[in-house]
């Protein structure tokens, strides 16, 4: 009989042979899983428990954000003796149980990943019936979602004294570097990266003073790709308005 020792970070430390038949509760999850936006990811989670040959009702749960209190993104329940865990909740229909909880496997597939899915996830199993017991991973698995840059907004806004400024906001992971090019700017003017608070994947670059009419192009680039978008500035000379 094999018992697995788990440290507080839930990494496998070592395996020892014991004569005792009693397992203890533990959960094995990797610290991090990486996947690209739009693709699928697998969040592995296996567990051991002290209730030999438990065949009663069970519930498998996955939470996001924080253990014990975070919102559930997936839940399924298996009746006594059943191998089938019937899905009761799948947030946005994108979470699917891959593992078989009866075989101590709660692994989850997440489909159509978005940058907003980049967070920590926690698996939990609950036994009911003859045995009432439950266990949840404390540290969880961090889902790291990567994405090629996408320019989400580009605009020209009025500034004081009849001037104009341009703003470009892009998202991506790693956060993209932004550059402006346009009339009298040269080929590419690097902009300071400024992730917006609470929006870690969004980066905004400002061109504070547009001095010439013409086409202004914002380029966003990271290790996964690049994206471009343009705005046009055309001022009606002799008037205070502008067309963009």
């Amino acid at each position: 009989f094999v018992r697995t020792k788990i440290d507080t970070t839930e990494n496998l430390l070592n395996t020892e042979v014991h004569s005792s038949p009693a397992q203890r509760w533990s959960m094995q999850v990797p610290p991090e899983v990486s996947a690209e936006a739009g693709d699928a990811a697998v969040l592995p989670c296996t567990f051991t428990h002290p209730h030999r040959h438990y065949d009663g009702p069970l519930t498998a749960i996955w939470r996001a954000g924080e253990p014990y209190a975070g919102p559930q993104v997936f839940r399924c329940a298996a009746a006594r003796g059943s191998e089938l865990c019937q899905t009761a909740l799948s947030l946005h229909g994108r979470f699917r149980l891959l593992g078989n909880p009866r075989r101590n496997d709660l692994s989850l597939r997440v489909e159509r990943l978005a940058l907003a899915d980049d967070r920590r996830y926690f698996c939990r199993v609950e036994f009911a019936g003859d045995v009432h017991d439950r266990y949840e991973s404390r540290h969880g698995v961090r889902l790291h979602v990567t994405a090629a840059p996408r320019i989400v907004n580009i605009s020209v806004l009025p500034s004081p004294a009849h001037a104009f400024r341009a703003l470009c906001t892009a998202e991506g992971e790693p956060p993209p570097a932004l550059a402006w090019s346009g009339p009298a700017l040269g080929n590419s003017l690097a902009a300071v990266r400024s992730p917006r608070e609470g929006h870690g994947h969004l980066v905004t670059a400002e061109l504070p003073a547009l001095t010439h009419d013409g086409r202004y192009t914002c380029t966003a680039a990271n290790s996964l790709g690049r994206s471009e978008a343009s705005v046009y500035l055309f001022r009606f000379h002799g008037a205070s308005g502008a067309s963009t």
């Epitope: 990797p30 899983v33 996947a35 693709d39 699928a40 990811a41 697998v42 969040l43 592995p44 089938l84 019937q86 899905t87 009761a88 909740l89 799948s90 229909g93 699917r96 149980l97 891959l98 593992g99 692994s107 597939r109």
Partner: antibody
Framework: EVQIVESGGGLVQPGGSLRLSCATS????????MNWVRQAPEKGLEWVAQ??????????FYAESLEGRVTISRDDSESSVYLQMSSLRAEDTAVYYC????????????WGQGTLVTVSS | DIVLTQSPDSLAVSLGERATISCRAS??????????IHWYQQKPGQQPRLLIY???NLASGIPARFSGSGSGTDFTLTISSLQAEDVATYFC????????TFAGGTKVEIK
């Protein structure tokens, strides 16, 4: 015992339409995704469409080669699934199988015996 | 789309001997240790039957002489001791990315 029985196949002219039906029994239909897979004469297998269950918002997925010409639907109260096909072409001639898959895996654990669709003038 | 290529196209094996079929994917079908490759058997005039799911898991009711292995892009179906009733065409299928696709199949016969 799981049973899956297809019907509705037959001879249809090019450009015509056909509705295939699949009746199931022996399992809790609501818990599973259902699919259609086809096999042209003496050829390989080609996945056609999938419809998920209520928990997964009855989401549907189609093979690109057929998208816009086929619609998959299901009736949970009748434990049945359907495939509406239109603008049929000679290359759509095949045996059409209704298959079951678990919500966690897009593999086909049970298959019907199939229904033959022949598109010919 | 992920393209699956099976080899050989056909295979003749003596009764009791080992039969090995290969399935190669155009890109990796493994995520975090889970391989989304499945194997089916189709006997003449019958519908396909699931043999192996997720590369190595034996489907319900399938004899233990069938086994699957592999990860990434290369997978193998093995029949450890061929029986007369194993004469069939074998297909692999991927569910890593939609559309789910099948390989062209391998026909297994008795030598």
């Amino acid at each position: 015992e799981v049973q899956i029985v297809e019907s509705g196949g037959g001879l249809v002219q090019p450009g015509g339409s056909l509705r295939l039906s699949c009746a199931t029994s022996g399992f809790n239909f609501n818990d599973y995704f259902m699919n259609w897979v086809r096999q042209a004469p003496e050829k390989g297998l080609e996945w056609v469409a999938q419809i998920r269950n209520k928990i997964y918002t009855y989401a549907t997925f189609y093979a690109e080669s057929l998208e816009g010409r086929v619609t998959i639907s299901r009736d949970d109260s009748e434990s049945s699934v359907y495939l509406q096909m239109s603008s049929l072409r000679a290359e759509d001639t095949a045996v059409y199988y209704c298959t079951r898959s678990l919500t966690g895996g897009d593999y086909f654990d049970y298959w019907g015996q199939g229904t033959l669709v022949t598109v010919s003038s | 789309d992920i393209v699956l290529t099976q080899s050989p196209d056909s295979l003749a094996v003596s009764l009791g001997e080992r039969a090995t079929i290969s399935c190669r994917a155009s890109q990796s079908v493994t995520i975090s240790g889970y391989s989304f490759i499945h194997w089916y058997q189709q006997k003449p005039g019958q519908q396909p039957r699931l043999l192996i799911y997720r590369a190595s898991n034996l489907a319900s009711g399938i004899p233990a002489r069938f086994s699957g292995s592999g990860s990434g892009t290369d997978f193998t179906l093995t029949i450890s001791s061929l029986q007369a009733e194993d004469v069939a065409t074998y297909f692999c299928q991927q569910s890593r990315k939609s559309p789910w696709t099948f390989a062209g199949g391998t026909k297994v016969e008795i030598k």
